[in-house]
């Protein structure tokens, strides 16, 4: 049973480490300004980020990622004529 308990603890610990690692990666992305300036948004020259800002980091990084993906699809369609990549979610709004 002790082995099982250790296994469970190790798995939980690994998950925490993964989350911390992901958080650090996102911090580095934000610090380096990955996602660019398209669409404006908050400045990229912010001070090192605290736990208090973690929700904001994830939201901001995801928002930047979405913008980047959207503009990539747009460029593929309008400058690359790759119409299969066109956004066609007409019914959404």
């Amino acid at each position: 049973r002790r082995d099982v308990a250790h296994g469970i603890l190790n798995e939980a610990y690994r998950k925490v480490l993964d989350q911390l690692s992901a958080g650090k990666h996102l911090q580095s992305l934000v610090a380096r300004g990955v996602g660019g300036s398209l669409g404006g948004g908050a400045g990229d020259d912010a001070e090192p980020l605290s736990k208090r800002h973690s929700d904001g980091i994830f939201t901001d990084s995801y928002s930047r990622y979405r913008k980047q993906m959207a503009v990539k699809k747009y460029l593929a369609a309008v400058l690359g004529k790759r119409y299969k990549q066109r956004v066609k979610n007409k019914g959404r709004r």
Epitope: G36, L38, L75, V78, L79, G80
Partner: antibody, heavy 112, light 109 residues
């Protein structure tokens, strides 16, 4: 005939607002990216931003905050709302379906 | 952000001449998504070439594009009277969307 027609341009005072329209005839705009581009008198082309089929808009960093692109699929029309206008916003404003079909442009003059 | 620099800014040529316009990018153009447009005074731009070298439907075959990365060219193999206009390159920039070059005016010599 397939065409885009911009309207809504004119003379506006600095600090004022204007809404430009881009109406399509002979084509359903709903599944296309729609782009706004402007051209100051005697100058080159400047990309403003685009709106996708779902209604999400993306802008050049200089345009974010003052300019808003929207669309009304039921009217087959796209809009460019411009606020806090400045003299340097004086230009011909073009809308384009993707970037291969363009309207004739509408002139916006910002002057007191 | 990408800056596209076209050269020359003005080009004087005669009917029948072979004309080459260069578009240089400050950094690699995303996906090689570079297009060329033709614009005449008081008119909207006309789409000529996409993805650096692919001819838009209906555009005469005397127009051709080449290049990749940061160096692109538009060539008109034999200039026709209808070709006197201003030409713009436009490149994909995932930070800023689309960047336009400053334009090249092709005028009659």
């Amino acid at each position: 005939e397939v065409q885009l027609v911009e309207s809504g341009g004119g003379l506006v005072q600095p600090g004022g607002s204007l809404r430009l329209s881009c109406a399509a005839s002979g084509i359903d705009l709903n599944s296309y990216y729609m782009t706004w581009v402007r051209q100051a008198p005697g100058k080159g082309l400047e990309w403003i931003g685009f709106i996708d089929a779902g209604g999400d808009a993306y802008y050049a960093s200089w345009a974010k905050g003052r300019f808003t692109i929207s669309r009304d699929n039921s009217k087959n029309t796209v809009y460019l709302q411009m606020n806090s206008l400045r003299a340097e916003d004086t230009a011909v404003y073009f809308c384009a379906r993707d970037l291969d079909l363009w309207g004739q442009g509408t002139l916006v003059t910002v002057s007191s | 952000d990408i800056v596209l620099t076209q050269s020359p800014s003005t080009l004087s040529a005669s009917v029948g001449d072979r004309v080459t316009i260069t578009c240089q990018s400050s950094e690699s153009v995303y996906g090689n998504y570079l297009a060329w447009f033709q614009q005449k005074p008081g008119k909207a731009p006309k789409f000529l070439i996409y993805e650096a070298s692919k001819l838009e439907s209906g555009v005469p075959s005397r127009f051709s594009g080449s290049g990749s990365g940061t160096e692109f060219t538009l060539t008109i193999s034999s200039l026709q009277p209808d070709d006197f206009a201003t030409y713009y390159c436009a490149g994909g920039d995932i930070s800023e969307g689309v960047a336009f070059g400053g334009g090249t005016k092709v005028e009659i010599k």
